[in-house]
């Protein structure tokens, strides 16, 4: 995403971040020398979450809310250096990076309450299907997460072979330049899917915004 | 008022096939997450399938896996269950229900069909 | 698979009375994942409760849920004779969502 503006403000964190953050300190406190297996780590955070309840978990909120404020608040007077605004090129006939368990799920129950709530902003709309994922059980996960999983597997497949054939303008910027880091470039492509994957769902949350129908 | 009926039940020999239909009315069928139970005789309830609001995504018990597909029709606002190879312990009446949310505990059922196997 | 199990198989009482139906899970149960069901003979099975102890649509405040691990309880405060029946917990926290074999309430 090249080297963004240091004035810009920090990105607002979420409830599950300022979780994770608590669970890294924690850890370093009773660990100061042990170096930490991320995968390990993230996967007991992940469980350790699952299990919380509402309440243990209402002190994260708070401090997501409260992030979000002051992020909203220094937006406000963030002026955002000349040229920033220009969209990285995308190629149209790039393999789209497939959807989350969770995105999955969102498609099936977006209508329901969509049409049960048919004044809900679609910030409010997303709310509820996060909590009715986090409320949802792990077994009833279990098809979005299998279909997730089928679509990734395709997805490398697919990204493996587009990157195989090469990109349609690599030809033209010279081989030396196009081999310039294969490992950040990869980085900033999975950033990239990952925010169109975040713009992909908004744009389906204002299609829908415009054809709207008990709990 | 929602309402659930089940059709297709009768007497079946072992091997055979069968499709079960609920009919749902009363609510947004679409909207939501719909399964069979079934009850066989002097026995409790043993769930048998369920099937996401879209009919995308679908799950089942061991003793229906390789045998027994659900289906839905949103624009018909029916639930099926397509039966094969039937065997004398799948006797039983089989309800369909609605799950309230998106787990698996259902606040609707029918009144039941009951499939009889036997030669 | 997880294993719902009930005590006792048949419970005798009479209107008026408190009824305290069990239910046993063979290993340990977030409660959010418990419900429990009314059935009447001929008729569609009802939910009373799910998540532990949330009464469904309808259900009357004399039916109430409570329980953890695996020890979760149906408790009727006073038998109102529409209340006979057989009673049903389920786990719905891990597939294959099992019931128990059921409490049969009857008239003593």
């Known amino acids: 995403m090249g080297k963004g503006d240091p004035k810009k403000p920090r990105g607002k964190m979420s409830s599950y971040a300022f979780f994770v953050q608590t669970c890294r300190e924690e850890h370093k406190k009773k660990h100061p020398d042990a170096s930490v297996n991320f995968s390990e780590f993230s996967k007991k955070c992940s469980e350790r979450w699952k299990t919380m309840s509402a309440k243990e978990k209402g002190k994260f909120e708070d401090m997501a809310k409260a992030d979000k404020a002051r992020y909203e608040r220094e937006m406000k007077t963030y002026i955002p250096p000349k040229g920033e605004t220009k969209k990285k090129f995308k190629d149209p006939n790039a393999p789209k990076r497939p959807p989350s368990a969770f995105f999955l799920f969102c498609s099936e129950y977006r209508p329901k309450i969509k049409g049960e709530h048919p004044g809900l902003s679609i910030g409010d709309v997303a709310k509820k299907l996060g909590e009715m994922w986090n409320n949802t059980a792990a077994d009833d996960k279990q098809p979005y997460e299998k279909k997730a999983a089928k679509l990734k597997e395709k997805y490398e497949k697919d990204i493996a072979a587009y990157r195989a054939k090469g990109k349609p303008d690599a030809a033209k910027k010279g081989v030396v330049k196009a081999e310039k880091s294969k490992k950040k470039k990869e980085e900033e492509e999975d950033e990239e899917d990952e925010e169109d994957e975040e713009e992909e769902e908004d744009e389906e949350d204002e299609d829908e915004e415009e054809d709207d129908d008990d709990e | 008022e929602v309402q659930l009926l089940e059709s297709g039940g009768g007497l079946v020999q072992p091997g055979g096939s069968l499709r079960l239909s609920c009919a749902a009315s009363?609510?947004?069928?679409?909207?939501?997450?719909m399964t069979w139970v079934r009850q066989a005789p002097g026995k409790g309830l043993e769930w048998v399938s369920s099937?996401?609001?879209?009919?995308?995504?679908?799950i089942y018990a061991d003793s229906a896996k390789g045998r027994f597909t659900i289906s839905r029709d949103n624009s018909k606002n029916t639930l099926y269950l397509q039966m094969n190879s039937l065997r004398a312990e799948d006797t039983a009446v089989y309800y369909c229900?609605?799950?309230?949310?998106?787990?698996?505990?259902?606040?609707?059922w029918g009144q039941g069909t009951l499939v009889t196997v036997s030669s | 698979d997880i294993q719902m199990t009930q005590s006792p198989g048949t419970l005798s009482l009479s209107p008026g009375e408190r009824a305290t139906l069990s239910c046993r899970a063979s290993?340990?149960?977030?409660?959010?994942?418990v419900a429990w069901y009314q059935h009447k003979p001929g008729q569609a099975p009802r939910l009373l409760i799910h998540g532990g102890s949330t009464r469904a649509t309808g259900i009357p405040v004399r039916f109430s849920g409570s329980g953890s691990g695996t020890d979760f309880t149906l408790t009727i405060a006073t038998l109102e004779p529409e209340d006979f029946a057989v009673y049903y917990c389920?786990?719905?926290?891990?597939?294959?969502?099992?019931f128990g074999q059921g409490t049969k309430l009857e008239i003593k």
């Open positions: 099937i996401s609001p879209s009919g995308g995504y679908t």
């Open positions: 389920q786990q719905y926290g891990s597939s294959p969502y099992t």
């Open positions: 229900a609605r799950a309230l949310s998106t787990g698996s505990f259902w606040d609707y």
């Open positions: 009363g609510f947004t069928f679409s909207y939501y997450m």
């Open positions: 290993e340990s149960l977030t409660s959010t994942y």
